[in-house]
């Protein structure tokens, strides 16, 4: 007796698909062997014909696939295109030889059956319309035209030319003829439902001279389509329920037993779990389309189907299309800490994953915004320039080839709270949604800059100094000016990290950047921030304003250390970095397949493609290395 | 609300043949998974059999104790779903409960309970020996 366990019989038709789930023990090593489909033959061999290794035969080339799932200890073995030549006896399986646990499974692939010659078939999906042509012989021509369909015990009236109309078709049934040819009429039904399949008669006349002719209605439920997605990714639902429906409200649900739960419409509903993850983008007027659904979890899992109805509600008769999503634990995409917390006048540092293999991307971060069918707007980019809203206080730093890029953003306030969307125009797998919650400040900043009010004078010396606490003295300390293309660490030397001193003189550590001599182009914003390697930690800005020297005044610069800037931002450390151990991430946005989706989505305007060089430090038109010293006191 | 009514139980000896019948009331599905489970007296409910299907394909399912013995099959049109047990033993005895999911793609394990989402009141087979 196997522990494996399967269906015994799959049977289908030529040209169709199976999806068939193989069941195994919840065991380590179970999840992770290899898993196999083989067929056997005449001497008890068993051919292999797909295996969780990589291999694939040459029979299934193109047309199969098989994919574990080791959270729900099963493995899928999806085959289309099937032929008669894919009747037989097969295995699926566990171990490294086709020796190993396994399951037999019978597959029987029939001719699609044929019906009485004199039947005329129509397929129609479910929501769409069907017309139904009968001929009739000249004399018919006066007579009584009728469409009926037929019942156990008899032939029930669907509509005749008289126009009665069975209740049940009211609305939906049109008996009409065209032009002037008297030898054929013609019956649309339209908003088709399951119940509206099965045998139908036409007639014109009556009695033997009847004109009598058979037609099969078959209403198909679309097959759905199997979406395999990672946890953590997001999925694009691409809907094309045709122009009949153009004009119409879009939805897109989720099965539960027989309702089907709408999470998000084209009339701005929106189920809470999808808050900040969730977009609905009309693509043209033909009743196009698409959901994206960044930040895959595992409950996301399950039966989904886009349809159209002025309800923006699923209603019987109306065009749908169907899928099955899978969210697969054993996920590429790395688990990071889904709400990042700040405090007002503090920072964040926001880690976002992106492919390794696709360094070379353009990385963006936009703010998901909820009203109307939601967008997620570009904040800030490697070739888009920082929005104006957030002069001073966004930046966005990229480190080549480790799979991540920094995004930091400085004097919060409570308005910065909200969902925010790390992307690329690389991998649309690699989508992640970060919530920010702000809270209100309750004690002293931990980097603070003084003095506060800081004006340069033209052709002088001008420090800045940057207090920070004693838990950051072993981090790496850093000035950068900011510009709307990033923000340009400026080079320095930190003498302070260097000393091998054990003791830490809480009000003596500060890293100071000096302007020397002062120029026009040194007014903006800098930053002063903490980092350990590449990981970004808390940042804090400074705006100053250069101006000319007024006669009769000399300009005193303040140094003193204890001259506390009171506006300095803050922010609790537990919290700033987001790549602290105890980090519990979860999603993972994703739309945009592309750069100028990205654009769609977000509504964005053309300034915000300019191109620029985003925080890296060697695009910048003007090196600082000469005039700006750094030094520790 | 689907309803399901079972019929065809009864007594039979050891080594006969029943057939039980499950019909499902309102719509037919599209897609789903009818299954069947049994309960004999003094025991926890087990999977006996289960028939999947969407669109033209149907997958079977059976537990080891009934393999080659019953089979479980379709009538689209009727919605109803049959099950055929043949060389019927006396451990067979139970009451047997359909069992019905109704969904777009039929979901996790057929032998889980869970899976199910409407069930019948049960029909009573007894083999005696």
């Known amino acids: 007796k196997s522990p494996i366990f399967g269906p015994q019989e799959v049977s289908s038709i030529e040209g169709d698909s199976v999806s068939i789930t193989c069941y195994y023990p919840d065991t380590s090593v179970n999840r992770h062997t290899r898993k196999y489909w083989c067929r056997q033959g005449a001497s008890g061999m068993c051919t292999t014909l797909i295996s969780s290794n990589g291999y694939l035969s040459k029979e299934y080339s193109g047309r199969a696939n098989l994919i574990n799932f080791p959270e729900n200890n099963t493995f899928v073995i999806n085959i289309e295109q099937l032929t008669q030549d894919d009747t037989g006896s097969y295995k699926c399986g566990l171990g490294t030889s086709n020796r190993g646990l396994s399951f037999d499974v019978s597959l029987e692939v029939s001719q699609v059956p044929e019906l009485p010659s004199d039947t005329h078939v129509y397929t129609k999906d479910i929501g769409r319309n069907v017309t139904i042509e009968c001929p009739f012989k000249r004399e018919n021509a006066p007579s009584k035209k009728s469409l009926c369909k037929k019942t156990n015990q008899s032939c029930e009236l669907v509509i005749d030319s008289t126009e009665k109309v069975n209740p049940s078709y009211i609305g939906r049934a049109k008996l009409f003829m065209k032009g002037t040819d008297l030898t054929v009429f013609y019956v649309n039904i339209s908003h088709l439902t399951h119940n509206d399949a099965g045998l139908y008669i036409c007639q014109a006349g009556e009695g033997p001279s009847a004109d009598k002719k058979n037609v099969d209605l078959q209403v198909l439920a679309p097959e759905p389509e199997l979406l395999y997605k990672d946890l953590r990714s997001s999925v694009t639902f691409e809907c094309d329920l045709g122009r009949e429906v153009a004009n119409e409200a879009k939805y897109l649900c989720r099965m539960n037993k027989e309702t089907c739960d709408v999470i998000i419409n084209t009339l701005g509903k929106r189920d809470p779990d999808f808050e900040g993850r969730i977009l609905i983008t009309p693509k043209d007027d033909n009743g196009r389309f698409s959901v994206l659904i960044t930040g895959l979890r595992k409950e996301d899992a399950g039966h989904y189907q886009c349809g159209a109805h002025s309800s923006g509600l699923p209603q019987e008769g109306w065009p749908i299309q169907t899928w099955q999503l899978f969210v697969n634990e054993e996920s590429t995409i790395p688990n990071r800490r889904s709400v990042v917390k700040g405090v007002t006048g503090g920072s964040v540092a926001i880690a976002c994953p992106y492919n390794p293999k696709e360094s070379s991307s353009l990385k963006y971060w936009c703010r998901w915004e909820g009203d109307g069918n939601g967008h997620c707007p570009v904040l800030v980019g490697t070739q888009a320039q920082v929005q104006e809203e957030y002069e001073g206080r966004l930046a966005l730093f990229d480190q080549p080839g480790n799979g991540t890029y920094t995004v930091i953003l400085n004097q919060l306030t409570t308005e910065d709270a909200g969902f925010y969307w790390c992307l690329t125009n690389g991998d649309s797998r690699w989508r992640t949604t970060i919530e920010l919650q702000v809270a209100e400040a309750t004690r002293e900043p931990n980097l603070e800059v003084t003095p506060q009010n800081a004006t340069a004078v033209l052709g002088e010396t001008f420090t800045v100094s940057c207090h920070y606490p004693c838990k950051f003295y072993s981090q790496e300390k850093y000035w950068c000016k900011w510009s709307n293309k990033g923000c340009h660490i400026l080079p320095s030397h930190d003498e302070g990290a260097r000393q091998s001193s054990v003791s830490c003189d809480q009000s003596s550590q500060l890293v100071s950047m000096t302007l020397n001599p002062v120029s026009k182009e040194d007014e903006g914003w800098y930053w002063c921030g903490v980092k350990q390697g590449q990981t970004y930690g808390e940042t804090t800005a400074i705006y100053i304003a250069v101006e000319e020297r007024t006669r009769g005044s000399s300009h005193v610069n303040p140094t003193d250390a204890n001259a506390r800037a009171k506006v300095a931002l803050e922010e609790e450390v537990v919290d700033s970095s987001i790549s602290e151990k105890e980090n519990k991430a979860i999603p993972n946005p994703g739309p945009f397949a592309n750069e100028r989706e990205i654009q769609n989505v977000g509504d964005q305007a053309q300034e915000n493609r300019a191109s620029g060089d985003a925080g890296s430090a060697d695009g910048q038109s003007r090196s600082s290395s000469s005039k700006h010293h750094h030094h520790h006191h | 609300q689907v309803q399901l009514v079972e019929s065809g139980g009864g007594l039979v000896q050891a080594g006969g043949s029943l057939r039980l019948s499950c019909a499902a009331s309102?719509?037919?599905?599209?897609?789903?998974?009818m299954g069947w489970f049994r309960q004999a007296p003094g025991k926890e409910r087990e999977f006996v059999a289960a028939?999947?299907?969407?669109?033209?394909?149907?997958?079977?399912y059976y537990a080891d104790s009934v393999k080659g013995r019953f089979t479980i099959s379709r009538e689209n049109a009727k919605n109803t779903v049959s099950l055929q047990m043949n060389s019927l033993k006396p451990e067979d005895t139970a009451v047997y409960y359909c069992?019905?999911?109704?969904?777009?793609?039929?979901?996790?394990?057929?032998?889980?309970?869970?899976?199910?989402?409407?069930w019948g009141q049960g029909t009573l087979v007894t083999v005696s020996s």
């Open positions: 069992a019905a999911r109704q969904s777009l793609v039929a979901g996790g394990d057929p032998r889980g309970q869970s899976e199910y989402d409407y």
């Open positions: 028939i999947s299907w969407s669109g033209h394909t149907t997958y079977k």
């Open positions: 309102g719509r037919a599905f599209s897609s789903g998974r």
